[in-house]
Interface confidence: low
Amino acid sequence: SGVFQLQLQEFINERGVLASGRPCEPGCRTFFRVCLKHFQAVVSPGPCTFGTVSTPVLGTNSFAVRDDSSGGGRNPLQLPFNFTWPGTFSLIIEAWHAPGDDLRPEALPPDALISKIAIQGSLAVGQNWLLDEQTSTLTRLRYSYRVICSDNYYGDNCSRLCKKRNDHFGHYVCQPDGNLSCLPGWTGEYCQQPICLSGCHEQNGYCSKPAECLCRPGWQGRLCNECIPHNGCRHGTCSTPWQCTCDEGWGGLFCDQDLNYCTHHSPCKNGATCSNSGQRSYTCTCRPGYTGVDCELELSECDSNPCRNGGSCKDQEDGYHCLCPPGYYGLHCEHSTLSCADSPCFNGGSCRERNQGANYACECPPNFTGSNCEKKVDRCTSNPCANGGQCLNRGPSRMCRCRPGFTGTYCELHVSDCARNPCAHGGTCHDLENGLMCTCPAGFSGRRCEVRTSIDACASSPCFNRATCYTDLSTDTFVCNCPYGFVGSRCEFPVGLPPSFPW
């Protein structure tokens, strides 16, 4: 679709005569008829296949024609066409004399023709005017012409239809050749595809408008490059969505089981050394002078009964001092000046001479100890309590106070986490060093088999277009991670439908 435009500029008829030579009375009131048709080697009569147009009376005899285009007038003359411009044409311009006001052909005398010119040739679509002048013996006509495309038509033949648009079907303006030029922030054949925020992850992010970055399920962050860990993941991270990879010192499905109680809680006091011994369990090795599960109790140095052979212990600011009984000497009263002849063994102990009678050794009966069998046996001396249990003397017996998670006379037994039957729906319980594990029957899941599940949500391969399926363990539903170019809960839709009608 386009327009052939003809701009009449000047007509000269100095003598004011008709084509027949007869003069016009009082002068030649001149109007023009224009016929545009297909190319003919010899321009001949016949239908004006590309259109016709007539002017009103433009002047008398000789006159210049005013450019009226800005005021909505009729110069240049417009010959619209609704087909592909062929590039060639024939043009007939007739100048007529109008004796009266009726310009219809049938109202004019047959000899009212002043002049007739016919041209033919090729003409490309363009903004530039072609200037021409045709002279006969009596008249001269100066004019120019061009072909331009109608609004929304482009290309060498005005055959390319293009309307600028900025909606669901495209975001573009039209170039002179009719090709699309995308508006800023849009790309693709029809400028339908938004250009996402710079750096937006190609697979994990997408956008519905420019400079946006919307995350696919399982991803987060401004650029959708951070995975979302499993719902409930406490001390863990992920490298793909819904994972829960535990930080150092944490364990369990949700990384909520403390495997490094020492570091996270620092339970040992007074400079003691802490050792992890299982989930939420630890052992403190006390520095000299301290005792208790957490080395929280300060020891008197005499509490360890350092004085032997019945020596009495005196606490001092910088330690202790042993007061030895008669016949003994040394820091701990460990040296004897006695021999078996002095009956040094108490509580029925038997005396044995050593080093040719220079000193002796007592062999003590049960329940007594010491160099001279002078001490009742302290049942806690051998530290019989296992797993960090605290030994307590209770009269003639002893007992172990066990730390959480242990039981038995000597704290030698783990408390069975399975004793409480924690696995629901008939799950089988397994005691582990750091807790327990439930093996669930078909149809149930969760740490304690508490979640009812029909089947693995991904088992039916619900995701399309080679998307990755993840089972969300907290809801037992599936999530599809779409490959680039697809969206939808099952990745079933291509991103961005091309346009309908791009204008």
Partner: antibody
Framework: QVQLKESGPGLVQPSQTLSLTCTVS????????VSWVRQPPGKGLEWMGG???????DYNSALKSRLSLSRDTSKSQVFLKMNSLQTEDTAIYFC????????WGHGVLVTVSS | DIQLTQSPASLSASLDEIVTITCQAS??????LAWYQQKTGKSPQLLIY???SLAGGVPSRFSGSRSGTQYSLKISKLQVEDTGIYYC?????????FGSGTKLEI
């Protein structure tokens, strides 16, 4: 000049399938989309669906389960298939160039009756 | 789906009068609204596209305007040939939707 012409049966039995063809000339349907619009007697216009330049489709939510659009670009034809017809599907069916819808066919009257 | 609420359903006016028909969109559809005139037994004819642009060959007494999500078609100096039903259409997002129509009698 752009022209669109609908063709198909004027009478369809209830519960049967309607098949209509829209023949487009003067423009390429592999670039421009074609929509179907219908108008029951004495009622307003209803957009049924469209098939776009690349062959992808969109449908009116209420007709989605029954409606299918396809095309043959070599013949410049767009096809409408709608199943399970009822008397309320009696209407004039127009095809139109999608976008501003400034080119329309004359429409074809389809009567659903036994 | 985007709804278009068109009003009034019908109106009667005299020659040379001015009438206004409105269409309210349920969502922001930008300028992607068109107005059509349909005469009895004929296909709809595009009057206004892009909310405000006059289609080719349509008299200048027809004009379109927009205020937020409300769109208006104004016809000044009514002529006999303006009798017909007028529809609005949103083509911002598929599924596209038409207004319910306004019947204009002169």
């Amino acid at each position: 000049q752009v022209q669109l012409k609908e063709s198909g049966p004027g009478l369809v039995q209830p519960s049967q399938t309607l098949s209509l063809t829209c023949t487009v000339s003067g423009i390429s349907i592999s670039i421009y989309g074609v929509s179907w619009v219908r108008q029951p007697p004495g009622k307003g216009l209803e957009w049924m669906g469209g098939i776009w330049g690349d062959g992808s489709t969109d449908y009116n939510s209420a007709l989605k389960s029954r409606l299918s659009l396809s095309r043959d670009t070599s013949k410049s034809q767009v096809f409408l298939k709608m199943n399970s017809l009822q008397t309320e599907d009696t209407a004039i069916y127009f095809c139109t160039l999608s976008g501003d819808f400034d080119y329309w066919g004359h429409g074809v009257l389809v009567t659903v009756s036994s | 789906d985007i709804q278009l609420t068109q009003s009034p359903a019908s109106l009667s006016a005299s020659l040379d009068e001015i009438v206004t028909i409105t269409c309210q969109a349920s969502l922001d559809i930008g300028n992607w609204l068109a107005w059509y005139q349909q005469k009895t037994g004929k296909s709809p004819q595009l009057l206004i596209y892009g909310a405000t642009s006059l289609a080719g060959g349509v008299p200048s007494r027809f004009s379109g305007s927009r205020s937020g999500t409300q769109y208006s078609l104004k016809i000044s100096k009514l002529q006999v040939e303006d009798t017909g039903i007028y529809y609005c259409l949103q083509h911002y997002r598929a599924p596209f939707t038409f207004g319910s129509g306004t019947k204009l009698e002169i």
